[in-house]
């Protein structure tokens, strides 16, 4: 049985202020059962960027259809990037439970924000 891998292929992404950033994440298995969530930063101060339960997250859209079955692409797009969005973004798989528990994290993608071209 294949062990879940979380692949964040881009170590870093640079985006001009005001543009959109695409953060890629794919998984290799549907197991364990449980949701994917995106965070900026690590540890107790990390910030939730997207999940299906909370929100709304008006600046975040999923790259794949949220209704797609057996989907393994959990990439997101963040619109209207500002310098406050800079940081490392982690795609994290949670194991279903009461409460859900963190199972595995991707390696992270560092987002840097360039000045808006004049």
């Amino acid at each position: 049985e294949e062990e879940l891998q979380i692949i964040q292929p881009d170590k870093s992404v640079s985006v001009a202020a005001g543009e959109s950033a695409i953060l890629h994440c794919t998984i290799t298995s549907l197991f364990p059962v449980g949701p994917i969530q995106w965070f900026r930063g690590a540890g107790p101060a990390r910030v939730l960027i997207y999940n299906q339960r909370q929100g709304p997250f008006p600046r975040v859209t999923t790259v794949s259809e949220t209704t797609k079955r057996e989907n393994m692409d959990f990439s997101i797009s963040i619109s209207n990037i500002t310098p406050a969005d800079a940081g490392t973004y982690y795609c994290i798989k949670f194991r279903k439970g009461s409460p859900d528990t963190e199972f595995k994290s991707g390696a992270g993608t560092e987002l840097s924000v360039r000045a808006k071209p004049s």
């Epitope: 549907l30 059962v33 949220t66 797609k68 079955r69």
Partner: antibody
Amino acid sequence: DVQLVESGGGVVQPGGSLRLSCAASGFSFSNFAMTWVRQAPGEGLEWVSTIGSGDTYYADSVKGRFTISRDNSKNTLYLQMNSLRAEDTAVYYCAKDSTVSWSGDFFDYWGLGTRVTVSS
Amino acid sequence: EIVLTQSPATLSVSPGERATFSCRASQNVKNDLAWYQQRPGQAPRLLIYAARIRETGIPERFSGSGSGTEFTLTITSLQSEDFAVYYCQQYYDWPPFTFGGGTKVEIK
């Protein structure tokens, strides 16, 4: 074609045990969560248990009495039912889970069911 | 636990007519709702998932709508094989997965 065939039902006395099996074919069994749903006579559908790879989930009504398991080498799902009660009398259906991207699971294929009767 | 309430419990419709019935959730389930059909003596069959997406092979006369707490299944021009019991199921918050009590569609 996806096929799910349940077996192992029967008549058992209260306090007794039964082991249900569900033989799966037509899909990559090991890649999908699987579920048991039951239906008491003349009643609606009640979720019983779901298994992922090794992760298992149970309805409160069966927790501690029923155990779900799977053998991926045999493409078979099991439900071990102990300490059976009259209220466990039902048709037990095996179902294949389908996962929606960012959400949860629904059941896209069902077996025909196997009848369990708990009676003295 | 999310409770799903289906209404009406029984719907009497003539063949060729339209049938509409509802499923109300006790809390917001977004679009995480499926509909199943169960004919007498048969296993349930998936009709709709994500509140509105028809499963492959399901006729176009079946349609789902709604989001949040109010959902509707509509069958236009009922055929003889459509007389059955219909169940909704939420998968927004589980365990447990929960089903509605069902709506029986019978011949008028």
